[in-house]
Amino acid sequence: AGVFELQIHSFGPGPGPGAPRSPCSARLPCRLFFRVCLKPGLSEEAAESPCALGAALSARGPVYTEQPGAPAPDLPLPDGLLQVPFRDAWPGTFSFIIETWREELGDQIGGPAWSLLARVAGRRRLAAGGPWARDIQRAGAWELRFSYRARCEPPAVGTACTRLCRPRSAPSRCGPGLRPCAPLEDECEAPLVCRAGCSPEHGFCEQPGECRCLEGWTGPLCTVPVSTSSCLSPRGPSSATTGCLVPGPGPCDGNPCANGGSCSETPRSFECTCPRGFYGLRCEVSGVTCADGPCFNGGLCVGGADPDSAYICHCPPGFQGSNCEKRVDRCSLQPCRNGGLCLDLGHALRCRCRAGFAGPRCEHDLDDCAGRACANGGTCVEGGGAHRCSCALGFGGRDCRERADPCAARPCAHGGRCYAHFSGLVCACAPGYMGARCEFPVHPDGASALPAAPPGLRPGDPQRYL
């Protein structure tokens, strides 16, 4: 396992005449981002074939607005590396596609527009753990400068990230037959478990006893280069060392077809068969369409039927970005209540609730009243993970077992006297007041200000509050 790292140094007009127009304008500010696609081997695969080694998308670069009249400079770039993790062995030879995308930020209807500015492709040999390799690629009038490397993730080491390193068991040296792990000299190579004789440079294994070959090598022990084991070339003199025919010069030598195009000879010259998304004599003109599948994570691509028209990705819920490349962290809005733990599973949002809570967002208190009785006719109320009793009149305490003094709160108004009663309390009102709590003044003409006294009771009589 390891990581392929790509560092973009500059993207701008290439040398020579015909400098490109700036991709951004005062009316349409824009910013760049990059996409890299990696495939194992020196394959002639079409551009739309899957990025079997992996793919990565950069962050957006700073917003850029063209200065009127100024030539297009190198454009401002996103920060950081593009990193493509690989799980298995590093193949040693690989194909890459690097796309430069423009996001227009003008006030257009329907949101920003995205378009492919340039796409470069190439095939390279690269050993893991080596230094940064520098490269320059041109696409039309644009020039892209970049560096790349492959590095192993511990405990893997070696040119293919297939050797394993382990901390030393003894302080000074490795066990019998085991070498120190350069550059980690304080660690030792783990015991080899591949088939005996399996080439350490060109073979690797994931199961004990097997020997699997890196691209370009074959044979039971991965010691035979593919180029010398299949003598199929139709031209040229014989090679004494290999017994194979060595090709002489031809119009397709050096592959004049750019961006992964394949070359075939014609009676007069050559012809390029371009991968989807490219056209021109040498496949040098690029344009991306919905057929190229630019939308990630199940995004729906609309528009972009031909390379000259833009497309838009309609992203499924939970994804954003011009190519639906960014997963949204819905847990950042803290949807789980009562201290629940939020889990964004992509297809759904889940809350892991603390004890005492339930529901899809931990919004329900569990029934704290189960098996808990409130005495003397009290009713149980759940809340906050603990039960509480709402007691009947005349009772109090946690379980309504304590007899309450109903007169303690001085419920009788206007100087009325309070008497405790088996069913509550009774107020004996002072002259001139009436009501259950002596709250109503009696008018001089004998009429009360609010409800009349019940039949059989005269103003001033003690009234029982039920």
Partner: nanobody, 115 residues
């Protein structure tokens, strides 16, 4: 079904202000959480406990408010910077009844801040 309708996006000079609004409609029992995202990250919102939460990059410049009667949140954006340029998406976690909750997204509204 629930819909989120956004409004208020547009083109503004750096240092200027805009107000984004998002109204939820449809089968709504209660709104659990609601806020605004851009480029996949939370900008500002109300959590399920009712507190306002802001991204560090907008604190002191953006203010979120709510109108529970209208099932609506409003994002007041002041002192806008070019780096605030983005499509702003309204998002809401909504109960359609007592036991069913789903996450909903608006279509997005573009905010462009010119230098």
């Amino acid at each position: 079904q629930v819909q989120l309708q956004e409004s208020g996006g547009g083109l503004v000079q750096a240092g200027g202000s805009l107000t984004l609004s998002c109204a939820a409609s449809g089968s709504i029992f209660s709104i659990n959480a609601m806020g605004w995202y851009r480029q996949g990250d939370l900008v500002a919102g109300f959590t399920s406990e009712g507190s306002a939460k802001y991204a560090d990059s907008v604190k002191g410049r953006f203010t979120i408010s709510r109108d529970d009667a209208k099932n609506m949140v409003t994002l007041q954006m002041n002192s806008l910077k070019p780096e605030d340029t983005a499509v702003y998406y309204c998002a809401a976690d909504i109960f359609s009844d007592r036991d069913h909750v789903d996450w909903y997204w608006g279509q997005g509204t573009l905010v462009t801040v010119k230098p």
